[in-house]
């Protein structure tokens, strides 16, 4: 349930999900890069 994040605004909720998605993509790329470099 929203990872413990509470927000009353639906658009803010969507923004939080977009940020989370972006971070997941960035961290995923970094992880893949580290594995590749090893």
């Amino acid at each position: 349930h929203s990872d413990g994040i509470f927000t009353d605004s639906y658009s803010r909720y969507r923004k939080q999900m977009a940020v989370k998605k972006y971070l997941a993509a960035v961290l995923g790329k970094r992880y893949k890069q580290r594995v590749k470099n090893k």
Epitope: H1, S2, D3, T7, D8, S9, Y10, S11, R12, Y13, R14, K15, M17, K20, K21
Partner: antibody, heavy 117, light 112 residues
Framework: EVQLVQSGAEVKKPGSSVKVSCKAS????????MHWVRQAPGQGLEWMGL????????RYAQKFQGRVTITADESTSTAYMELSSLRSEDTAVYYC??????????WGQGTLVTVSS | DIVMTQSPDSLAVSLGERATINCKSS???????????LNWLQQKPGQPPKRLIY???TRESGVPDRFSGSGSGTDFTLTISSLQAEDVAVYYC?????????FGGGTKVEIK
């Protein structure tokens, strides 16, 4: 264009649970905000909750908190809404709907759930 | 929760005449992102609702231009400039600014 196809009508006993499915096609399922809305016979519309499948992140209406569970299966592009401890007042048409621009742009055809002893 | 109050409950209008439906919210629907998430839906008997207007005044593609939405803050209006037979339906306003998302009670539009 996104299309939503829901499961068929259900008749349930009071106290039991119902699970309604909603299969999406024509869009990136994991990146959609999938909502559930219900409509009792001859009544208005009532928002129940949503799921963002990419993180399985849910948000429920206070009224249904603890009684509704929304899940999603990305492999089949299907969302599910389970409502427990059914009572006669839960007799309604249940709709799934997809958000676009902060509004429900696409709706399923509806699933009638009848709660009767 | 935000209370959405629609008026009138029902409306009988002659073909070709104007129909006006009002919607009032208990709190401003202007979001921090600058948008107003006030929507209008049309529902015909036995069918799911259909989006007509979003962001208070943006018409859904394919919706005839006789339908228009206006208003800001807490007061909104749906206008059908020249009622056609196919416009007979129930119209709902709803807000998508604040959780929990809430709907007005609906306005039934009929032909006089």
């Amino acid at each position: 264009e996104v299309q939503l196809v829901q499961s068929g009508a259900e008749v349930k006993k009071p106290g039991s649970s119902v699970k309604v499915s909603c299969k999406a096609s024509g869009g990136t399922f994991s990146d959609l905000y999938m909502h559930w809305v219900r409509q009792a016979p001859g009544q208005g519309l009532e928002w129940m909750g949503l799921i963002y499948p990419i993180f399985a992140d849910t948000r429920y209406a206070q009224k249904f908190q603890g009684r509704v569970t929304i899940t999603a299966d990305e492999s089949t592009s299907t969302a599910y809404m389970e409502l427990s401890s059914l009572r006669s007042e839960d007799t309604a048409v249940y709709y799934c709907a997809i958000d676009q621009d902060g509004s429900f742009a696409y709706w399923g055809q509806g699933t009638l759930v009848t709660v009767s002893s | 929760d935000i209370v959405m109050t629609q008026s009138p409950d029902s409306l009988a209008v002659s073909l070709g005449e104007r129909a006006t439906i009002n919607c009032k919210s208990s709190q401003s629907l202007l979001d921090a992102d600058g948008k107003t998430y006030l929507n209008w839906l049309q529902q015909k008997p036995g069918q799911p609702p259909k989006r007509l207007i979003y962001w208070a005044s943006t018409r859904e593609s394919g919706v005839p231009d006789r339908f228009s939405g206006s208003g800001s803050g807490t007061d909104f209006t749906l206008t059908i400039s020249s009622l056609q037979a196919e416009d007979v339906a129930v119209y709902y306003c709803w807000q998508g600014t604040w959780f929990d998302l809430t709907f007005g009670g609906g306005t039934k539009v009929e032909i006089k």
